[in-house]
Amino acid sequence: FTITAPKDLYVVEYGSNVTMECRFPVEQKLDLLALVVYWEKEDKEVIQFVEGEEDLKPQHSSFRGRAFLPKDQLLKGNAVLQITDVKLQDAGVYCCMISYGGADYKRITLKVNAPYRKINQRISMDPATSEHELMCQAEGYPEAEVIWTNSDHQSLSGETTVTTSQTEEKLLNVTSVLRVNATANDVFHCTFWRVHSGENHTAELIIPELPVPRLPHNRTH
């Protein structure tokens, strides 16, 4: 008795849904009462299917209402784990364990990304020095580098700080500040670049015509 996992790595976006598969041999009609299916993530019980039905009692609270084992797929010899509204904490190694006559298991890795799509920006000016302070801030995962460029695509040196956001999701809050002497209508870009995936998102900042007063430092995003 051998089970197969068509894919052993799934990479999905935070907030999306994922469907992970383990296939097992079924001859003729599946006897649901003889089938045992476990999906586990490390020491957390995700799905337990025993004696023809899902047992939700041992299911870990973090998966409650989000993890499903479609019965119609089971009948085809496919133990599918569906997780909705994927969280960062769902990332890790899952194990599907199936007993049907014999027993076997396969491991599957889930990676979760949160792109730095929504980039907040702010431009302020220090009246004493006429130096502009450009700020870009975004949340995502995993860590991103922030690259500043001017309209000639030349790299500029900004100062980036990374904190863990106080949301339940523990996304990374990446803020980068560039101090630069600039004139009205000068264009700058901040790019949030996730090193490992190569994915990037860019915002354009244009120095306004009118001087912008420096905002207080105790601002929140």
Epitope: I3, V36, D43, V93, M97, S99, A103, Y105, T109
Partner: antibody, heavy 116, light 107 residues
Framework: EVQLLESGGGLVQPGGSLRLSCAAS????????MSWVRQAPGKGLEWVSS????????VYADSVKGRFTISRDNSKNTLYLQMNSLRAEDTAVYYC?????????WGQGTLVTVSS | DIQMTQSPSSLSASVGDRVTITCRAS??????LNWYQQKPGKAPKLLIY???SLQSGVPSRFSGSGSGTDFTLTISSLQPEDFATYYC?????????FGGGTKVEIK
């Protein structure tokens, strides 16, 4: 601190029986699959048997299938291995191991010697 | 069954040496390979799981790499307490199988 303590090993004649026990502490025993792994004198490691967390499913190496029975009592935090029809080639140190992403914790082992 | 082949079966090295042990699976096991250290008369101890993840409490001089069928355990700077036998193990289906072991001895 995770602790696994095997007992029940000893000298037994070919064809005889032994029951090994493994007392677990320091973790939620019922949340993990458990296994037995053995090591013949001067040899490498050989997986023997595994039991899933609630005891419903048991799996065995071909070399012991039909002769050994793994079981667990989650209320007593104890893993068992009933060994029947023992053979000389079953002589080994038997380890119980907690199974998660790997055999992450092992007991100190108990020696089973099958000899006439 | 998936066969695990370790090489070399033994090696001699000095304190401070960089040591590399390889493990080959007879078919792809993705990255689900573990490494253990065993000293004489003692139980095995988990060093690396999932090919490259360092088990808690294990010194950072130990590292693992590889995926598919070929894997490596590296000890960056051998210490006196590292002289032992090392085993790889595939952990992606029954029966769970171990390599034959690599004994690291003092030169």
């Amino acid at each position: 601190e995770v602790q696994l303590l095997e007992s029940g090993g000893g000298l037994v004649q070919p064809g005889g029986s032994l029951r090994l026990s493994c007392a677990a502490s320091g973790f939620t025993f019922s949340s993990y699959a458990m296994s037995w792994v053995r090591q013949a004198p001067g040899k490498g490691l050989e997986w023997v048997s595994s039991i899933w967390r609630n005891g419903i499913v048991t799996v065995y190496a071909d070399s012991v299938k039909g002769r050994f029975t793994i079981s667990r009592d989650n209320s007593k935090n104890t893993l068992y291995l009933q060994m029947n029809s023992l053979r000389a080639e079953d002589t080994a140190v038997y380890y119980c191991a907690k199974w998660s992403a790997a055999f992450d914790y092992w007991g100190q082992g108990t020696l089973v010697t099958v000899s006439s | 069954d998936i066969q695990m082949t370790q090489s070399p079966s033994s090696l001699s090295a000095s304190v401070g040496d960089r040591v590399t042990i390889t493990c080959r699976a007879s078919q792809s096991i993705s990255s689900y390979l573990n490494w253990y250290q065993q000293k004489p008369g003692k139980a095995p101890k988990l060093l690396i799981y999932a090919a490259s993840s360092l088990q808690s409490g294990v010194p950072s001089r130990f590292s693992g790499s590889g995926s598919g069928t070929d894997f490596t355990l590296t000890i960056s700077s051998l210490q006196p307490e590292d002289f032992a036998t090392y085993y790889c193990q595939q952990d992606n289906g029954y029966p769970s199988t171990f390599g034959g072991g690599t004994k690291v001895e003092i030169k």
